[in-house]
């Protein structure tokens, strides 16, 4: 036992950011005369937190009235704690020296850890859309949390994912930490309505995890399927040909009809039919005046979807021999036969 002991009863104290931290310190004696000081850290680079003798410390209040006779309690309270306040705090007794005060005895130190909530996780998807069966990456980021221990999970439509990689930075001690995770997701045709969720659990969240979401609709492109068919005749000298554009996403679509390679009409899809899976259908039709054609006609439905390279489907509209001989007077219907796409 020493003539004066500095007792810091708590080895560690944990405080939520924004709260006040009480750091306890007691002396076993008031002799020798001299001030007490609180420091964060040890050694030459230690930071003065409170000096009983002099100075202005607006965030620090003493728990007891230090000027009260026989007071041995030198505990302090630090207000509005932030992660930057984390560290080991030492209560140090100085004795009057000649000429300067001399460090006399230090407490064992109290480690202050600050519990800081992670920021709301931000989930971001790929910069460009990908088609089904391809793998896309989603990233999840959250910052400013402490302590370092944290749990991150990924879900797709409620099902936990396993293909992801997570890093918490920095690796060493820090006042606060950041988490970065990348998940790999294989797209399917039905993913327009799908959602990925990044879920973060931390001690500060009291069992109520934070979630960040991203819609796969922002990441997926479902290319259309095309089908060209001839509808029943409206008149003997007309053929009604339709192009059914099915199961595409997103909605941006431009369709061009070509007759024998020459542009007949271009239109932008407007009134679309939405399917249950979130994809769209659209139908375009073309009336062909068979009287104007002496030879067979190749009709092409060409679709440019979401800025991608155009896809097309072609059909040969056969002009009958009878119609070829008699021109516009011939009323036999033309026969439509599919051909291979261009």
């Amino acid at each position: 036992e020493d003539e004066l002991q500095v007792i810091q009863p708590e080895k560690s104290v944990s405080v939520a950011a924004g709260e006040s931290a009480t750091l306890r310190c007691a002396m076993t004696s008031l002799i020798p005369v001299g001030p007490i000081m609180w420091f964060r850290g040890a050694g030459a680079g230690r930071e003065l937190i409170y000096n009983q003798k002099e100075g202005h410390f607006p965030r620090v209040t003493t728990v007891s009235e230090l000027t009260k006779r026989n007071n041995l309690d030198f505990s302090i309270s630090i207000s509005n704690i932030t992660p930057a306040d984390a560290g080991t705090y030492y209560c140090v007794k100085f004795r009057k020296g000649s000429p300067d005060d001399v460090e006399f005895k230090s407490g064992a130190g109290t480690e202050l850890s600050v519990r800081a909530k992670p920021s709301a996780p931000v989930v971001s998807g790929p910069a460009v859309r990908a088609t089904p069966e391809h793998t896309v990456s989603f990233t999840c980021e959250s910052h400013g949390f402490s302590p370092r221990d944290i749990t991150l999970k990924w879900f797709k439509n409620g099902n936990e994912l396993s293909d992801f990689q997570t890093n918490v930075d920095p690796a060493g001690d820090s006042v606060s930490y950041s988490i970065h995770s990348t998940a790999r997701v294989v797209l399917t045709r039905g993913d327009v309505h799908s959602q990925v969720i990044c879920e973060i659990a931390h001690i500060t969240l009291q069992g109520d995890p934070l979630r960040g979401t991203a819609n796969l609709s922002e990441a997926i492109r479902v290319p259309p399927t095309l089908e060209v068919t001839q509808q029943p005749m409206r008149a003997e000298n007309q053929a009604n040909v339709t192009c059914q554009v099915s199961n595409f996403y997103p909605r941006g679509l431009q369709l061009t009809w070509l007759e024998n390679g020459n542009v007949s009409r271009t239109e932008t899809a407007s009134t679309l039919i939405e399917n249950k899976d979130g994809t769209y259908n659209w139908m375009s039709w073309l009336l062909v005046n068979t009287c104007a054609h002496r030879d067979d006609v190749v009709l092409t439905c060409q679709v440019e979807h979401d800025g991608q390279q155009a896809v097309s489907k072609s059909y040969a509209l056969e002009i009958s021999a009878h119609q070829k001989e008699h021109g516009s007077d011939i009323t036999h219907e033309a026969a439509l036969a599919p051909t291979a796409p261009l």
Epitope: E3, P32, K53, R69, R95, G97, F104
Partner: antibody, heavy 114, light 111 residues
Framework: EVQLEESGPGLVAPSQSLSITCTVS????????VNWVRQPPGKGLEWLGI???????DYNSALKSRLSISKDNSKSQVFLKMNSLQSDDTARYYC????????WGQGTSVTVSS | DIVLTQSPASLAVSLGQGATISCRAS??????????MHWYQQKPGQPPKPLIY???NLESGVPARFSGSGSRTDFTLTIDPVEADDAATYYC?????????FGGGTKLEIK
């Protein structure tokens, strides 16, 4: 039980130096300071200096140039050395524990005389 | 140096009566809310014995008949009631500033 015991030469010739040893028990010199106090015959007490637990010292400025206090923690001994003694240094020399001076030795009598 | 002046230099008190000894400092001995003034009792042929520390705190084993009071520059040791065993010389001492100093002493006689 806390005890302090002084041992000295008893008689010192003028202008010579004085060495006194204070041997302590019941406490550690690393944790407690030790004071030296003297008392001339029939007079009051005079504080000479202190050696603290960490080995640092503080002296009475009036005697500082003649005074040296040291210690050997392992032997639980504190040493007082005073140079250039004169007749007015004749006194009983005490060692006392800590800033509080809560325990005292019985003292050792020093006479400066030729 | 802080000079401590004790008064009276000596006093005689009847058994069972109260005794008051004064100690005046040439400057304040208060720091950080406490008075670094202490009192000792010395009997002939013996070392000083601590009685009171920090102006008013009784040392362990010291009878409650002894009490101390005061602050800054004016301090008092009171013995009430006085017993025959209290015959001794009483010293005040400050350790607020170097060099630490003692008062000249007050000799108490019991009548």
């Amino acid at each position: 039980e806390v005890q302090l015991e002084e041992s000295g030469p008893g008689l010192v010739a003028p202008s010579q130096s004085l060495s006194i040893t204070c041997t302590v028990s019941g406490f550690s010199l690393t944790g407690y300071g030790v004071n030296w106090v003297r008392q001339p015959p029939g007079k009051g007490l005079e504080w000479l200096g202190i050696i603290w637990g960490d080995g640092s010292t503080d002296y009475n400025s009036a005697l500082k140039s003649r005074l040296s206090i040291s210690k050997d923690n392992s032997k639980s001994q504190v040493f007082l050395k005073m140079n250039s003694l004169q007749s007015d240094d004749t006194a009983r020399y005490y060692c006392a524990r800590a800033g509080k001076m809560d325990y005292w030795g019985q003292g050792t009598s020093v006479t400066v005389s030729s | 140096d802080i000079v401590l002046t004790q008064s009276p230099a000596s006093l005689a008190v009847s058994l069972g009566q109260g005794a008051t000894i004064s100690c005046r400092a040439s400057e304040s001995v208060d720091s950080y809310g406490n008075s670094f003034m202490h009192w000792y009792q010395q009997k002939p042929g013996q070392p000083p014995k601590p009685l009171i520390y920090l102006a008013s705190n009784l040392e362990s084993g010291v009878p409650a008949r002894f009490s101390g009071s005061g602050s800054r520059t004016d301090f008092t040791l009171t013995i009430d009631p006085v017993e025959a065993d209290d015959a001794a010389t009483y010293y005040c001492q400050q350790n607020n500033e170097y060099p630490w100093t003692f008062g000249g002493g007050t000799k108490l006689e019991i009548k």
